[in-house]
């Protein structure tokens, strides 16, 4: 099912243009900004979503770094180069010929350079830590119930297999969701943890990417879980290469 047939829309990506011009008059949807055909039965790649977002730019965001190897998206929004499969190209450059290497979630993992900069491979982000703070509640959430609801959310809303949700930690009011997915573990058809994390990030900001589906309504035993802030840390299979100047 490439898209909803009735009114020809893309349930998993509202940043698309859809028309019944696929094989046999089937609904086909293309991502804004790139024109790449997307599979509307699953999440659209973060690269294509960022590219689409640049046609309606919003404020960039800034996160903090918890340790020497964890990366955060300090650079905010940029118009990325995506490969034909919708993945980030290893090397990204801006209009002024400034270039840098990114990981599989599009976060810069080297110092910026010029057009001579080489990025030999797209390094996989295999571990994502989503750090949330929830709004005050009368009492703490039951950890087991919270864990179950978050695992179900990632499975049912983002189609991420439960085996990739490594852990859910909770110390009121902080919730940490650990996603792990090595290259060897990711089978064809599996949602990428980077894409799931991006959809989740947009959801908790009230910027849902889903078409015609309600916004995120997360409840634990009927009690709403409202997120105050989100920090996302990315760990790559190969540590990033920054100069010492950046680390001080």
């Amino acid at each position: 099912h490439t898209a909803a047939q009735d009114n020809c829309t893309c349930p998993t990506n509202k940043m698309t243009v859809c028309s019944p011009d696929g094989p046999g008059g089937r609904c086909q949807c293309r991502a804004l900004g790139s024109g790449v055909a997307v599979d509307c039965s699953t999440l659209t790649s973060k690269c294509l979503l960022l590219k689409a977002r640049m046609s309606a730019p919003k404020n960039a965001r800034t996160l903090v770094r918890p340790n020497e190897h964890a990366l955060v998206d300090n650079d905010g929004l940029y118009d990325p180069d995506c490969d034909p499969e919708g993945r980030f190209k290893a090397r990204q450059c801006n209009q002024t010929s400034v270039c840098w290497c990114v990981n599989s979630v599009g976060v810069r993992r080297t110092d910026k350079g010029d057009l001579s900069l080489r990025c030999d491979e797209l390094v996989r982000t295999h571990h994502i830590l989503i750090d949330l703070r929830h709004r005050p509640t009368a009492s703490a959430f039951n950890h087991s119930d919270l864990d179950a609801e978050l695992r179900r959310l990632f499975r049912e809303r983002y189609r991420l297999h439960p085996k990739f949700v490594a852990a859910v930690h909770y110390e009121q009011p902080t919730i940490q969701i650990e996603l792990r997915q090595n290259t060897s573990q990711k089978a064809a058809g599996d949602v990428d943890i980077g894409d799931a994390a991006y959809y989740f990030e947009r959801d908790v900001k009230g910027e849902s990417l889903f078409q015609g589906r309600g916004g995120l309504d997360l409840r634990v035993r009927g009690e709403p879980l409202q997120v105050e802030r989100t920090l996302i840390y990315y760990l790559d299979e190969i540590p990033p290469k920054f100069s010492m100047k950046r680390l001080t």
């Epitope: 179950a148 609801e149 695992r151 179900r152 499975r155 049912e156 085996k163 949602v191």
Partner: antibody
């Protein structure tokens, strides 16, 4: 690849009973196990589910509190039932999802019969 | 999420066509399965994702629908098709009373 239920029995009203689902030929970590029951001559009734990876459990609204699903080893899942009544008389099936993120049940055990009667 | 299945029973001659309908109380985004069950046996998955045939299932079985309305059509009925058929929403395990429809008994004359 197979699933097999065991533990079905004739029990008195008010009793408790634990059923076991044994998996063989596949890695349970890649799947969820669901329990479904069927009263004699009636339809299928979904009881609950466990994500084997992580161990999270989910129940039908009517089953919450009286039924508990848990993983007891790398190849077994149990269904604990308490305060049994005649209405719980049924064949109990365990089933496996297809390894995707949906809940399509492509492998079932043969079922085990639970009879609640005085 | 509740599933309403109709009719409860249907009888058709060999070579005929049977249509079974299933309605979900909310949109289940095509995440619907159809099962066939014969007496004394566990259910067997026939169709998943509303219209995809499970391996080994004859193409006489056809699933369709979207949103909240789904249909199973069995054409060129054979005696072996006599069974009870169930739909199941495969979208969520949260806040449900039963993931299955009530079942449809198909009698082949």
């Amino acid at each position: 690849q197979s699933l097999e239920e065991s533990g079905g029995d004739l029990v008195q009203p008010g009793a408790s009973l634990t059923l076991t689902c044994k998996a063989s030929g596949f890695d349970l970590n890649n799947y969820s196990i669901l329990w479904v029951r069927q009263a004699p001559g009636k339809g299928l009734e979904w009881i609950g589910c466990i994500y084997f990876s992580g161990g999270s459990t989910y129940y039908a609204n009517w089953a919450k509190g009286r039924f508990a699903i848990s993983k007891t080893s790398s190849t077994t899942v149990t269904l604990q039932m308490t305060s049994l009544t005649a209405a719980d008389t049924a064949t109990y099936f365990c089933a496996r999802d297809d390894g995707t993120t949906s809940y399509y049940l492509n492998l079932w055990g043969p079922g085990t019969l639970v009879t609640v009667s005085s | 999420y509740d599933m309403t299945q109709t009719p409860a029973s249907v009888s058709e001659p060999v070579g005929g066509t049977v249509t079974i309908k299933c309605q979900a109380s909310e949109d289940i985004y095509n995440l619907l399965a159809w099962y066939q069950q014969k007496p004394g046996q566990p259910p067997k998955l026939l169709i998943y994702a509303a219209s995809d045939l499970e391996s080994g299932v004859p193409s006489r079985f056809k699933g369709s629908g979207s949103g909240t309305e789904y249909t199973l059509t069995i054409s060129d009925l054979e005696c072996a098709d006599a069974a009870t058929y169930y739909c199941q929403q495969a979208y969520t395990v949260g806040n449900i009373d039963n993931a299955f429809g009530g079942g449809t008994e198909v009698v082949v004359k």
